[in-house]
């Protein structure tokens, strides 16, 4: 069950066990009002492990549109602007929560779903396996 | 109004206008069953723009624990293992959706919230501003 002391103004709920259904207001509150001015959307081009953004749309998911990163190269860009294959461009992945319509096509009924998305790429030193 | 051709098995919903309240099953479905074996949790150490992970906990949020990346250096690690300040380590940020208890402390009532999280770091060429 849930551990939080109940606010007397909470909606009633019959079943308080997992798995449980909760009410969610889809009017999104944006906590990023003081968006960091340093935050840049051009890192994908300026990175030594640059990436492209691919559009993924699924109308049964909330959010329906997710932009995913795909690394442009296997290696990393060196100081001369060439790809250095002694280093590796790898995707940084994150598990995020999305809402999945359940049953399908229902406007007001969802289930939480965990998906893995690639957010960008970073340059790493490869793991070298030495053969005896 | 709502856009989806209604599945006859959908729960009823009186108000279909924005903002709207929907029902969400919190029994998380994990779509990442075929998790990529290449997915690595040690990139934060091997990256030329390494980062530390900081735990952020908020019991009024779902998920209550989020791990955030903070770049270790202003510069990037070069081939000699030293920090090169001619390059910049920058956080890759992503807007994600979380559930915020509303009213506070309610176990079964939430509002969607958008937050900005740093997922990892990447090494970028700096933007140089030339002064005339």
């Amino acid at each position: 069950g849930i551990t939080i002391p109940r606010n007397p103004g909470c909606p009633n709920s019959e079943d308080k066990n997992f798995p449980r259904t909760v009410m969610v207001n889809l009017n999104i509150h944006n906590r990023n009002t003081n968006t960091n001015p340093k935050r840049s959307s051009d890192y994908y081009n300026r990175s030594t492990s640059p990436w492209n953004l691919h559009r993924n749309e699924d109308p049964e998911r909330y959010p329906s549109v997710i932009w995913e990163a795909k690394c442009r190269h296997l290696g990393c860009i060196n100081a001369d602007g060439n790809v250095d294959y002694h280093m590796n461009s790898v995707p940084i992945q994150q598990e995020i929560l999305v809402l999945r319509r359940e049953p399908p096509h229902c406007p007001n009924s969802f289930r939480l779903e965990k998906i893995l998305v690639s957010v960008g790429c970073t340059c790493v030193t490869p793991i070298v396996h030495h053969v005896a | 109004g709502i856009t989806i051709p209604r599945n006859p098995g959908c729960p009823n919903s009186e108000d279909k206008n924005f903002p709207r309240t929907v029902m969400v099953n919190l029994n998380i479905h994990n779509r990442n069953t075929n998790t990529n074996p290449k997915r690595s949790s040690d990139y934060y150490n091997r990256s030329t723009s390494p980062w530390n992970l900081h735990r952020n906990e908020d019991p009024e949020r779902y998920p209550s624990v989020i791990w955030e990346a903070k770049c270790r250096h202003l510069g990037c690690i070069n081939a000699d293992g030293n920090v090169d300040y001619h390059m910049n380590s920058v956080p890759i940020q992503q807007e994600i959706l979380v559930l915020r208890r509303e009213p506070p402390h309610c176990p079964n009532s939430f509002r969607l919230e958008k937050i900005l999280v740093s997922v990892g770091c990447t090494c970028v060429t700096p933007i140089v501003h030339h002064v005339a």
Epitope: H54, P59, S64 | I4
Partner: antibody
Amino acid sequence: EVQLVQSGAEVKKPGSSVKVSCKASGYTFTDYEIHWVRQAPGQGLEWIGVNDPESGGTFYNQKFDGRATLTADKSTSTAYMELSSLRSEDTAVYYCTRYYRYESFYGMDYWGQGTTVTVSS
Amino acid sequence: QIVLTQSPDFQSVTPKEKVTITCSASSSISYIYWFQQKPDQSPKRWIYATFELASGVPSRFSGSGSGTDYTLTINSLEAEDAATYYCHQRSSYPWTFGQGTKLEIK
């Protein structure tokens, strides 16, 4: 009130470029993608591509790939469409339209007033 | 690419008449969208996700269909409905529009 206000009409020479702006107001700019559609005189509608102001992602109709460049400036809530190597067939009204990223069923709900681009020598 | 073919291209109709515009897709699609455009105006979203009327659209309009065949119906035409109507698909890239159906009031 949601508004998408586009820049004024342009007359361009063949081979040159044009950049059309689309200033958004009345909503959270990064919650919506900006799509661009054009309409040649007396013709139908043609989708050019999409820009996501949040991530910087772009996707183009292959017909325009390499010639069209879609960008956005989050600080001013303005989207841009640049079309290069202009030819007479690019004479058209260019529209920007928004598209809700969270629930795509709503489709392209608000449109700019359109920008007439005339390509003539 | 998916080609959307509207029928008819042009229709001259008497007020109070029932009007049916069809949109046929070259491949199966999930949903159709309809836009109304009047001369020297931007397109207006009219029907979305096949069935749903956009805000402010009169209830005499309706949308239906599935797969490759979709319909916009006006069950009792009024003078203000004179316009060009475009169907639109976004099930497959590139997103495409029908060639348009121009409705004229007799």
